[in-house]
Amino acid sequence: KNLKSPQKVEVDIIDDNFILRWNRSDESVGNVTFSFDYQKTGMDNWIKLSGCQNITSTKCNFSSLKLNVYEEIKLRIRAEKENTSSWYEVDSFTPFRKAQIGPPEVHLEAEDKAIVIHISPGTKDSVMWALDGLSFTYSLVIWKNSSGVEERIENIYSRHKIYKLSPETTYCLKVKAALLTSWKIGVYSPVHCIKTTVENELPPPENIEVSVQNQNYVLKWDYTYANMTFQVQWLHAFLKRNPGNHLYKWKQIPDCENVKTTQCVFPQNVFQKGIYLLRVQASDGNNTSFWSEEIKFDTEIQAFLLPPVFNIRSLSDSFHIYIGAPKQSGNTPVIQDYPLIYEIIFWENTSNAERKIIEKKTDVTVPNLKPLTVYCVKARAHTMDEKLNKSSVFSDAVCEKTKPGNTSK
C-alpha cells in the first residue's frame, strides 16, 4: 500500500523555538516515521533538517538549526515505513516574519503603596530579536486580587513602577512584549501576584517640581512632617529601556544630599543635555521613607520652559492679561520655539476659591469680576506636545484691584 504524504504542516516560532506540527494522513498505518528537509533561498539542493528525522510523533523541534532568521526557507515532509510517501512541500516562509514574541520574564518588588516591575525578554540573548533588543516595549494588565477590576498600562519599558496602591493588598498582573517596528504583539506572561507591605511610618515626598533660576535648577517637593532630611537621586531615563539589565545605578545630586529643607538648588551644569529621572527620599534619622514617585526631567525643555511673564490691565468687571516671553537672567526674553498653552489661576484676595482659565492665546480676558475688589493672578505654561508633556512652575502671584463700576469700555 502506498504511503500518503502528511498534511496540514504548521510552523510555530516563538522567540528562538522552532516547532513543526503536522497531521498523519493515514491513521490506520502504524509504525510510520516522518522526516523533513529544508532548502534556503537560491539553493537547489535540499538538506536534512536536524532534529526532524525519523520522528514517530507529529511534532518536532528544529531550534538547534542555526538559520539566518531574515532569509526565506522552504520545508518538505514525507512519511516513511518500508517505503516512503511523496514529499509534501510547505509554503516558504521567513522565520523573523513568522516568529511570535514569547512571554517575558517578570520580577516584582513591593513597597507599601507601590510595586516595581522588572521585565526581561523571555529568551536571554535571543537570536530572533538580536537586532531589536532595545525596541521592545511592554504592556501590562494589573488588578487587585480581591476585585478583579483590570487596569491596562501601555508602552512601558523593562523597569516600571506603579504608584498609588493600597497597603497590605495583593495585586496580580501579566505582561506582554511588543515590537512596534515589526507590528508584533507577544504572548502574555503567566500571572504574577505580590502583596504590598504594611504602611510605612514615613510617607515618601510628593509633588516634585523642577524650575530654573539663573544658572541653577531648583528642585522643590512637599513633605508631611518637619525636621526631616532629604536626599535626591537621578538616573538616565534611557537606562529603563535596557533589556536584561536590572541594576539601576541611581546617582546622588551632591547639593541635594542630606538637605534639611524641602528644596535644593544645584547648578545646571550638573546635568548634560538629556532626559533624566529624579526621585527624593525622606529620613528622620531613625526611619526612612520609600522613594518618591520618579519624575521625568528633560534638560532641553526645562531650560526653556520658564513661567510666563504677564501684565494686567484692570477694568471694573474684568482683567485683560497680556502674556509675554519669560525673561532669563540679564532680562533677555526667552524664545519659545514650540507651541504653549497657558494656565491662568485667579482668586479673590480674601478667599481661597480659585478659578482657572486655559488659553492658547497670549491675550486673555478674565471675566465676571466684582468692582473695587483685589484679585490675584498666577500663570504657568504647558507644552502642547503630548510626548514632551512639560509644565513650567507657576509665576509669582500678581494682585490688582478692579476699577469702580461702569469702566468696562
Partner: antibody
Framework: QVQLVQSGAEVVKPGASVKLSCKGS????????MHWVKQAPGQGLEWIGR????????KYAPKFQGRATITADTSTSTAYLELSSLRSEDTAVYYC???????????WGQGTLVTVSS | DIQLTQSPSFLSTSVGDRVTITCKAS??????VVWYQQKPGKSPKVLIY???YRVSGVPSRFSGSGSGTEFTLIISSLQPEDFATYYC?????????FGQGTKLEIK
C-alpha cells in the same frame, strides 16, 4: 564564567594599613557594583561599602567611614579595599562581592584573611 | 541603620526536617531581602533574593516569603548538605545590613 579572585592573606601590625585586591573576570566590572564585606572569626557578616567602578562613586557603612577606602581600576578589572589604623578587632576575613541585578551580591571572592598582631 | 534580627540563632535538627528561619527588620524594607548560605571556610552563596525569588540552580526545597518587616526562609526537607549558617540581608537602604546568622547543626 564569572570569577572574583582575591589577594593572599596578610599579617600586619596595629596602626599600619593594608590594601586588599579583588580581580574580576568573565564580566565587565563597569556594569556592576563591587562590595566589600567583613567577617570576624566566628562572627557574622558586616557590610563595609561598595564602589561603582564606572565613576568611582562610593558608599560606606558609618562604622567604616574614614578608615576604609574602596577604589577600582577598570583597566585591570580590579577592586581594592584599603584599611588604615588597623587594630586587633580588624582581624577578619574580608570578602569582595559583585553587586548585580536587583542589587544582589551575586558572586563572591574566596576571601582574604587579615591578621592584626604585634 | 536598619537592624535585622534572625531567629533562632542556633538550631539543632535532623535530615528530613522542615526548617523555618525568620528575619525581622527594624523598619519596612519592602521586599528587598536576600538570604545567603555559608558553609565553614567558604564564601556566602545567594539562595533567595527580593524576599521570594530563588536563584537559578538552588534546590526547590528552599523558599522565601515575607515583606515589610517580617521575612521567612523555609527548607522543606533538610538534606545533609544544608547544614550551614544562613544570613538574611536587606538591600533597601544604605548601609546594607545582615542578620546575625542562624546556624543549623545535626541533632
Amino acid at each position: 564564567q564569572v570569577q572574583l579572585v582575591q589577594s593572599g592573606a596578610e599579617v600586619v601590625k596595629p596602626g599600619a594599613s593594608v590594601k586588599l585586591s579583588c580581580k574580576g573576570s568573565g564580566f565587565n566590572i563597569k556594569d556592576y557594583y563591587m562590595h566589600w564585606v567583613k567577617q570576624a572569626p566566628g562572627q557574622g557578616l558586616e557590610w563595609i561599602g561598595r564602589i561603582d567602578p564606572e565613576d568611582a562613586e562610593t558608599k560606606y557603612a558609618p562604622k567604616f567611614q574614614g578608615r576604609a577606602t574602596i577604589t577600582a581600576d577598570t583597566s585591570t578589572s580590579t577592586a581594592y579595599l584599603e584599611l588604615s589604623s588597623l587594630r586587633s578587632e580588624d582581624t577578619a576575613v574580608y570578602y569582595c562581592a559583585r553587586g548585580g541585578n536587583f542589587y544582589v551580591m551575586d558572586y563572591w571572592g574566596q576571601g582574604t584573611l587579615v591578621t592584626v598582631s604585634s | 541603620d536598619i537592624q535585622l534580627t534572625q531567629s533562632p540563632s542556633f538550631l539543632s535538627t535532623s535530615v528530613g526536617d522542615r526548617v523555618t528561619i525568620t528575619c525581622k527588620a527594624s523598619q519596612n524594607v519592602g521586599t528587598n531581602v536576600v538570604w545567603y548560605q555559608q558553609k565553614p571556610g567558604k564564601s556566602p552563596k545567594v539562595l533567595i533574593y527580593s524576599a521570594s525569588y530563588r536563584v537559578s540552580g538552588v534546590p526547590s526545597r528552599f523558599s522565601g516569603s515575607g515583606s515589610g518587616t517580617e521575612f521567612t526562609l523555609i527548607i522543606s526537607s533538610l538534606q545533609p548538605e544544608d547544614f550551614a549558617t544562613y544570613y538574611c540581608q536587606q538591600k533597601n537602604n544604605y548601609p546594607y545590613t545582615f542578620g546575625q546568622g542562624t546556624k543549623l547543626e545535626i541533632k
